[in-house]
């Protein structure tokens, strides 16, 4: 017995073939002697059944020999064993309909799971291979479950049901909802305009919901929120924003926000939320940024940062086109009765300069200069 | 994991300058430094400098300043050290060494250049 | 420059018994922003290059044995090779890489008794 494998809601073509190359009489039935469609002559006719809409044969192919019942719109049902009587002749076929789909939307939020469920027909063994579109391999039966969705899972999977050594291949598009980075970090001097972006990583139609970022200082106890506000149809309105600062933000998508100016104060990390309309839970960006300061005072010059850097980082202190003077692993470092000239600082991580600040030391009658 | 492969054993006449080349064999230099360092026969470490093969940024030991260049060729994923007005005292073996991106310290080294001054 | 200063010189332990080696730097390489100590111990045999044993004082490189262990803060560091092997014969070196440049200790010798 022949066995067909075939995908809810599409179309499978079974074949029957008589020896004589011309039209000659066929009956299509079910396992249950009930007809299906056959010939009178030239003219198709259909049975009682229940595929009597959704069956079909191609009449171009009758004078060749062929008699292809054709099911359109496939449903797990479907799946029966298909008898093909021509020429006192009875050929077998077995059709089996799968289905496969996600459990609910195919827009997931970042860390959300998926779960791919497969319909099968009673009495079927199938396997299951799923392909996440970086290249990851996952395994089941009915329940295929990938937990916390990441930005790379976005695209086509594509599973294959494997039974009776038959293969069916399913394509399925998931996008995850998502930013384009996880996190970033800006680096600025002191006094600096700050510019944050906010790209998504997908592309909807209409994008409605909320936001809000929750800003932790460095210098502060407790975290606060600059800035709430409202997404409709991709145009940002703002709700609510702190007086100090007093964040702008862009009207249109991508998010973009501007800190007027960098200072110590602000220096810190942040976190922009994002609740989509009709989605559970919440889309997240953290955002950080790391101030720099040279001052000097008095016989010392000092360079300061402040914000989260790494444990990588050094931070120098240099007269230009000279060699540092002092390069530390750490927040501050100083040079005592610094020599005239200008003097550089500067924040580096594997020998690349991630922020530099430039001050004018004068000779000691005069007072510095900041450029 | 990449691994540094470094040029042959060099004889060089005082005066002379000697070019020793470190490849990253199975990977390719990230955001990674490369250190130098040498060892004189019985002695122990010294740092000469290191590089940035990505940026080409440099960094060298005030002792050497004048005397060291680094250089790369990213398309090979090679760094370079060449030191000029060689003198006797240079005999050493020079490492390449990268600093660990994501911990620190020196974790992976070359195998050794042994460079002889002698006139 | 900071200037590492390893003690003792040479040091001949028994197999199994306990190998400790001192490492004094001339100013404190723990920074104060990041309350790290930026201090690396190295193994290095005849003929191979060194092998990075310690980072920040204390934090092992993965593969290395746990007889091997670093410990102290600021200026005083120790590395300690609690039960000694045959092939723990080696020199080893502290390195500070706190303040640019970085800067080796002269090397500890060590032996078997």
């Known amino acids: 017995k022949k066995v067909v494998l075939g995908k809810k809601g599409d179309t499978v073509e079974l074949t029957c073939t008589a020896s004589q190359k011309k039209s000659i009489q066929f009956h299509w039935k079910n396992s249950n002697q009930i007809k299906i469609l056959g010939n009178q002559g030239s003219f198709l006719t259909k049975g009682p059944s229940k595929l009597n809409d959704r069956a079909d044969s191609r009449r171009s192919l009758w004078d060749q020999g062929n008699f292809p019942l054709i099911i359109k719109n496939l449903k797990i049902e479907d799946s029966d064993t298909y008898i093909c009587e021509v020429e006192d002749q009875k050929e077998e076929v077995q059709l089996l309909v799968f289905g496969l789909t996600a459990n609910s939307d195919t827009h997931l939020l970042q860390g959300q799971s998926l779960t791919l469920t497969l319909e099968s027909p009673p009495g079927s063994s199938p396997s299951v291979q799923c392909r996440s579109p970086r290249g990851k391999n996952i395994q089941g039966g009915k329940t295929l479950s990938v937990s916390q969705l990441e930005l790379q899972d976005s695209g086509t999977w594509t599973c294959t049901v494997l039974q009776n050594q038959k293969k069916v291949e399913f394509k399925i598009d998931i996008v995850v909802l998502a930013f384009q980075k996880a996190s970033s970090i800006v680096y600025k001097k002191e006094g600096e305009q700050v510019e944050f972006s906010f790209p998504l990583a997908f592309t909807v139609e209409k994008l409605t919901g909320s936001g809000e970022l929750w800003w932790q200082a460095e210098r502060a106890s407790s975290s606060k929120s600059w800035i709430t506000f409202d997404l409709k149809n991709k145009e940002v309105s703002v709700k609510r924003v702190t007086q100090d600062p007093k964040l702008q933000m862009g009207k249109k998508l991508p998010l973009h926000l501007t800190l007027p100016q960098a200072l110590p104060q602000y220096a810190g990390s942040g976190n922009l939320t994002l609740a989509l309309e009709a989605k559970t839970g919440k889309l997240h960006q953290e955002v950080n940024l790391v101030v720099m300061r040279a001052t000097q005072l008095q016989k010392n010059l000092t360079c300061e940062v402040w914000g989260p850097t790494s444990p990588k980082l050094m931070l120098s202190l240099k007269l230009e086109n000279k060699e540092a003077k002092v390069s530390k692993r750490e927040k501050a470092v100083w040079v005592l009765n610094p020599e005239a000239g200008m003097w550089q600082c500067l924040l580096s991580d594997s020998g690349q300069v991630l922020l530099e600040s430039n001050i004018k030391v004068l000779p000691t009658w005069s007072t510095p200069v900041q450029p | 994991q990449v691994q540094l492969v470094q040029s042959g054993a060099e004889v060089k006449k005082p005066g002379a300058s000697v070019k020793v080349s470190c490849k990253a064999s199975g990977g390719t230099f990230r955001n990674d430094v490369i250190n130098w360092v040498r060892q004189a026969p019985g002695q122990g470490l010294e740092w000469i400098g290191w590089?940035?093969?990505?940026?080409?940024?440099?960094g060298y030991a005030q002792k050497f300043q004048g005397r060291v260049t680094m250089t790369r060729d990213t398309s090979t994923s090679t760094v370079y050290m060449e030191l000029s007005s060689l003198r006797s005292e240079d005999t050493a073996v020079y490492y390449c060494?990268?600093?660990?991106?994501?911990?620190?310290?020196?974790?992976?080294w070359g195998q050794g250049t042994l460079v002889t001054v002698s006139s | 420059d900071i200037v590492m200063t390893q003690s003792p010189d040479s040091l001949a332990v028994s197999l199994g018994e306990r190998a400790t080696i001192n490492c004094k730097s001339s100013?404190?390489?723990?920074?104060?922003?990041?309350?790290?100590?930026?201090l690396a111990w190295y193994q290095q045999k005849p003929g191979q290059p060194p092998k990075l044993l310690i980072y920040?004082?204390?934090t092992r490189e993965s593969g290395v044995p746990d007889r091997f262990s670093g410990s102290g803060s600021g200026t005083d560091f120790t590395l300690t090779i609690s039960s000694l092997q045959a092939e723990d014969v080696a020199v080893y070196y502290c390195?500070?890489?706190?303040?640019?440049?970085?800067?080796f200790g002269q090397g500890t010798r060590l032996e078997i008794k």
């Open positions: 920040w004082a204390s």
């Open positions: 390195q500070q890489y706190y303040s640019s440049p970085p800067t």
């Open positions: 100013q404190s390489v723990l920074s104060s922003s990041y309350n790290k100590n930026y």
């Open positions: 060494a990268r600093d660990n991106p994501d911990l620190d310290g020196m974790d992976v």
């Open positions: 590089m940035n093969p990505n940026s080409g940024n440099t």
